[in-house]
Interface confidence: low
């Protein structure tokens, strides 16, 4: 038996979805003009970084692409990146791959993703269309950190 990643359509409260632009993720209005990505989510088997108060330890990838979300510091600031990596390769690693790990927490019916490498930094979308998905410490009106996951086949 082998686990399989779960697939989700992801959107924020402003009806922004994630769209692949080259090897970057950007936020765009949910419309006929855009093809949103489907998010792959799988739980990390290694419990080294577990913190149930913060949520479940997960890896995040883009379905149909060998691309996974990871966090690294660029010019002193935690930054969200896409790396060529198969999510199942991450899952099969015995040791947790920290830069690729996120705490997935439920807030009501919405989901929040916090970087494990950079506690207090959350995946976010801005209110402006076409901006990259990014990491923020400032949760609120300008930076949307709550996402709705719709399960897809």
């Amino acid at each position: 038996w082998q686990a399989a990643p779960k697939s989700y359509a992801i959107r924020d409260s402003r009806q922004m979805v994630w769209v692949l632009s080259g090897n970057s993720l950007i936020a765009a209005p949910l419309s006929n003009r855009v093809k949103p990505v489907t998010l792959h989510l799988i739980t990390c088997r290694d419990t080294e970084f577990s913190d149930k108060k913060k949520g479940n330890l997960v890896y995040l990838g883009i379905r149909g692409k060998d691309l996974c979300l990871f966090c690294e510091e660029i010019q002193g600031k935690p930054t969200l990146q896409l790396k060529e990596k198969n999510i199942m390769d991450l899952y099969m690693e015995k040791k947790a791959q920290k830069p690729f790990l996120f705490f997935h927490n439920k807030e009501g019916s919405s989901s929040v993703f916090q970087s494990v490498s950079y506690p207090g930094w959350f995946i976010a979308t801005s209110s402006t269309s076409g901006q990259p998905i990014f990491l923020t410490q400032e949760r609120g009106i300008t930076n949307n950190t709550n996402f709705y996951l719709d399960s897809v086949e």
């Epitope: 409260s13 009806q15 922004m16 209005p29 949910l30 419309s31 709705y148």
Partner: antibody, heavy 122, light 111 residues
């Protein structure tokens, strides 16, 4: 064939809470491809979106009404409901419940109830 | 004042072509959000006429068509018939309001 039916009092006193229920028949309210909304139309005027709820229980409200509106779902009864508090005469309208379709994008409200007139008066 | 602007009324003779405009802004139609159109016959609930800017639900005659460009959208009705006399509403999503918005409605009169 999916049908929606609004029910609730036709007369509400000022400052009280308006409560309406929409019963869904011929389909399940828990389907992930749909969301459910309330829209109203004051006599002789245009349509105004009040709010929506989806199968996860996520709610979206018109900012101008947000402080007074609550939309909830009762999956066991295949119903969703609207509560609008502190009503005034300006809330007098025909209230419609509707189903919205979702598949990678929003596809509009494709099924509507026949509407119920709610009058706010003492 | 509606966020989406429609002409209050339009008219045409049977067989003619009429268009109804829906003008928004960079926070709704211009931001890329889809436009939907509804027909409301007198004394009845609205009916979805066009979804996703250009698509017709099954059962809607091909005399009805939708288009979108920039911050505006249009509904065109060709071969006008007496039964087309109704109110027509456009709808889109507005990111600054974080909600769905309707146009003020256009009354179509068939002369």
């Amino acid at each position: 064939q999916l049908q929606l039916q609004e029910s609730g009092p036709g007369l509400v006193k000022p400052s009280e809470t308006l409560s309406l229920t929409c019963t869904v028949s011929g389909g399940s309210i828990t389907s992930s491809n749909y969301y459910w909304g309330w829209i109203r139309q004051p006599p002789g005027k245009g349509l105004e979106w009040i709010g929506s709820i989806d199968y996860t229980g996520s709610t979206y409200y018109n900012p101008s009404l947000k402080s007074r509106v609550t939309i909830s779902v009762d999956t066991s009864k295949n119903q969703f409901s609207l509560k609008l508090s502190s009503v005034t005469a300006a809330d007098t309208a025909v209230y419609y419940c509707a189903r919205g379709k979702y598949y990678e994008t929003y596809l509009g409200f494709d099924v509507w109830g026949q509407g119920t007139l709610v009058t706010v008066s003492s | 004042q509606s966020v989406l602007t429609q002409p209050p009324s339009v008219s045409g003779a049977p067989g003619q072509r009429v268009t109804i405009s829906c003008t928004g802004s960079s926070s709704n139609i211009g931001a890329g959000y889809d436009v939907h159109w509804y027909q409301q016959l007198p004394g009845t609930a609205p009916k979805l006429l066009i979804y996703g800017n250009t698509n017709r639900p099954s059962g809607v005659p091909d005399r009805f068509s939708g288009s979108k460009s920039g911050t505006s959208a249009s509904l065109a009705i060709t071969g006008l018939q007496a039964e087309d006399e109704a109110d027509y509403y456009c709808q889109s999503y507005d990111i600054s309001l974080s909600g769905w918005v309707f146009g003020g409605g256009t009354k179509l009169t068939v002369l």
